[in-house]
Interface confidence: low
């Protein structure tokens, strides 16, 4: 298999995610999801001893040479070695398709086949905890043992015959070798083929490292355990079929006792530490909503109780290529719309008994700004503002004008790039705010962009409240009220008097205060009293006076 | 298991387009995720276009707007749509699958089909 992208950081689900155990586990932990075991949801694969020196090992028979050193032990593997490796190993290198599920050695050994290599033949049968390579079901000892050549000076002088055998588990070996030592000390070499049957091993060894692999029945809410072993074991009491023990309560402990008949006493006593159901366990997005553009939230929460230890309850979490050991995350500074992969898995005594994944996609981040072309009045009473819409995504538009303290919003289709406004005030400073919103989780308002301009003058209203009242024979007063709407930049109020089609008088003031005097007795006037913008007259306001005769 | 086959891959002038297929066989594809990817001479493999079993479809910066990603569930196959090819482009092509309950990665990769741009 190909390597695979390594994103750095925090990435979104477009990068693939790496796998959440390949960083190095704790000893006796399963690895994490190599094999057709963990295509099962909530399996759960344990190992229940480490990995033994004396699972897989050279044999001496106690008639041995006394001097040890004398062996040329090259190309046959020593104690030490977790695993000896099949000769079909070196054949067929298939790491990522075998379907066994990887448990943990002392040392979380996975040895690949020395090319080369003398190696003893794996038992058929046997399950490999250690290796990524399948069992080959040849068993025949296909080379030899060695013995030193170079020196006899090392070897006792001895008569008896010196039988060593080679023993893997229960395997049954048809080629020994036989070392002959003469008086005179030197060795001679003989291989002959002989049918030897060596003693089988305890079960207790033969199943040191036996894996199970828990399932989990939601209708039942029990357990079975599945023994991984090739061959039918015998379990004490029957308590297993077909290599399962059935009907494990969750968190209670069971002893299952192991023989087989390739093996002696003492039977193998595993020790079943069940995990809790996994429907007690419920990956839940703990994010805000008023936070979900930029940030994710994911808790395990136990939603029903289990006497498990919690303390052996271990959770984790992978989104991208960072790893947190924690019950729940929070992930921030995420970039809006984006999909993000996280991975998780809880773990019971270091053992996965459950995982999730969810690709979460970040909510709607709030949409960026429109950019203003323009915005203008071109009319007393109009205006227009024309914008390009902003690139995130967004489902309208809200514009508001504002006019001194008055506020009026618009609500505007997302695929407006203009809007006439009408029925405005005449020379009026409006304030416009032009925001794309998105309607998510919650509503998102992008930043707004302003603008803003005066409509033009208009004529203004009438003056109002006209009095025109004699202060002598010949004067009079005359005021009024402001117009209620001055429409244009400037304040001037003027008053026009006629008698009959003569204008007699015509003046101006800045307050609506004037005070007529020297006309004529006796004549009818007609008062015209009007505001004036600078750009346009406000229709008069009329009113007819008449003055009296004179007194004197 | 998935079996991944690429092909479509050529020398094309820059400006040019080229569609790539990629036929899956052994499992139909149209509820995992797929992805294209990329490894150029001396670099890693990098991600180029990921089609998500939900629907959506990321495309890496460098690709949007020139490269469509599309499915055609029926004949169990993906394609990559490039246009206004690069010489920057210039990689092996390789597509993937991410299938539910096995690997957390992207997984059974093809032989690859190579893209080459010239200048």
């Known amino acids: 298999q190909s390597p695979t992208p390594s994103p750095t950081g925090l990435t979104t689900a477009k990068m693939p995610s790496v796998p959440l155990s390949s960083d190095p586990l704790p000893t006796h932990t399963t690895a994490f999801s190599p094999a057709s075991t963990f295509e099962r949801e909530n399996d759960f694969s344990e190992t229940t001893t480490s990995l033994s020196p004396d699972n897989t090992s050279t044999q001496v028979s106690p008639d041995s040479l006394d001097n040890a050193s004398a062996f040329n032990t090259t190309g046959v593997s020593s104690v030490q070695t977790p695993h000896l490796p099949t000769h079909a190993d070196s054949q067929t290198p298939s790491a990522g398709t075998d379907t066994q599920t990887f448990s943990g050695s002392a040392a979380n050994a996975k040895l690949n086949p020395t090319p080369g290599s003398n190696a003893i033949s794996d038992v058929p049968g046997e399950r490999s905890t250690a290796s990524t390579f399948p069992t080959d079901p040849v068993s025949p000892l296909t080379t030899t043992l060695s013995l030193a050549h170079h020196s006899s000076a090392a070897l006792p002088a001895r008569t008896s015959n010196t039988t060593i055998t080679a023993n893997t588990s229960d395997a049954y070996l048809n080629a020994s070798e036989t070392t002959t030592l003469s008086p005179s000390g030197s060795a001679v070499i003989s291989t002959t083929t002989i049918a030897t049957t060596p003693s089988k091993p305890t079960c207790d060894e033969k199943y040191a490292n036996i894996t199970v692999d828990y399932l989990y029945n939601k209708e039942t809410k029990l357990f079975t355990a599945k023994l991984n072993v090739n061959e039918n074991v015998e379990c004490g009491n029957n308590t297993c079929t077909n290599n399962e023990v059935h009907n494990l309560t969750e968190c209670k402990n069971a002893s299952v006792s192991i023989s087989h008949n390739s093996c002696t006493a003492p039977d193998k006593t595993l020790i079943l530490d069940v995990p809790p159901g996994v429907e007690k366990f419920q990956l839940h997005d703990c994010t805000q909503v008023e936070k979900a553009d930029t940030t994710i939230c994911l808790k395990w929460k136990n939603i029903e109780t289990f006497t498990c230890d919690t303390q052996n309850i271990t959770y984790r979490f992978q989104c991208g290529n960072m790893i947190f050991d924690n019950k729940e995350i929070k992930l921030e500074n995420l970039e809006p719309e984006h999909e993000y992969k996280c991975d998780s898995e809880i773990l019971y005594n270091n053992h996965k008994f459950t995982n999730a994944s969810k690709i979460i996609k970040t909510d709607f981040g709030s949409p960026g700004e429109p950019q203003i072309i323009f915005c203008r009045s071109e009319a007393a009473h109009q205006g227009v503002i024309t914008w390009n819409p902003p690139q995130r995504s967004f489902h309208n538009f809200t514009l508001c004008y504002i006019k001194e303290t008055e506020k009026d919003c618009l609500n505007l289709d997302k695929n407006l790039i203009k809007y006439d406004l009408q029925n405005l005030k005449p020379y009026t400073k409006y304030v416009l705010s032009l925001h794309a919103y998105i309607i998510a989780k919650v509503q998102r308002n992008g930043s707004a962009a302003m603008c803003h301009f005066t409509t033009k003058s208009a004529p203004p209203s009438q003056v109002w409240n006209m009095t025109v009242s004699m202060t002598s024979d010949n004067s009079m007063h005359v005021k009024c009220r402001p117009p209620r709407d001055r429409n244009g930049p400037h304040e001037r109020y003027h008053l026009e008097v006629e008698a009959g089609n003569t204008l007699v008088r015509n003046e101006s003031h800045k307050n609506c205060d004037f005070r007529v005097k020297d006309l004529q007795y006796s004549t009818d006037y007609t008062f015209k009293a009007y505001f004036h913008n600078g750009d346009y007259p406000g229709e008069p306001f009329i009113l007819h006076h008449s003055t009296s005769y004179n007194s004197k | 298991e998935v079996q991944l086959v690429e092909s479509g891959g050529g020398l094309v002038q820059a400006g040019g387009s080229l569609r790539l297929s990629c036929a899956a066989s052994g499992r139909t594809v149209s509820r995992y995720d797929m992805g294209w990817f990329r490894q150029a001479p001396g670099a890693e493999r990098v991600v180029v276009a990921i089609?998500?079993?939900?629907?959506?479809?990321y495309y890496v910066d460098s690709v949007k707007g020139r490269f469509t990603m599309s499915r055609d569930n029926s004949k169990n196959t993906v394609y990559l749509q490039m246009n206004s090819l690069k010489p920057e482009d210039t990689a092996v092509y390789y597509c993937a699958v991410r299938t539910e309950r096995s690997s957390l990665d992207f997984h059974s990769w093809g032989q690859g089909t190579q893209v080459t741009v010239s200048s």
């Open positions: 089609s998500w079993s939900g629907g959506s479809t």
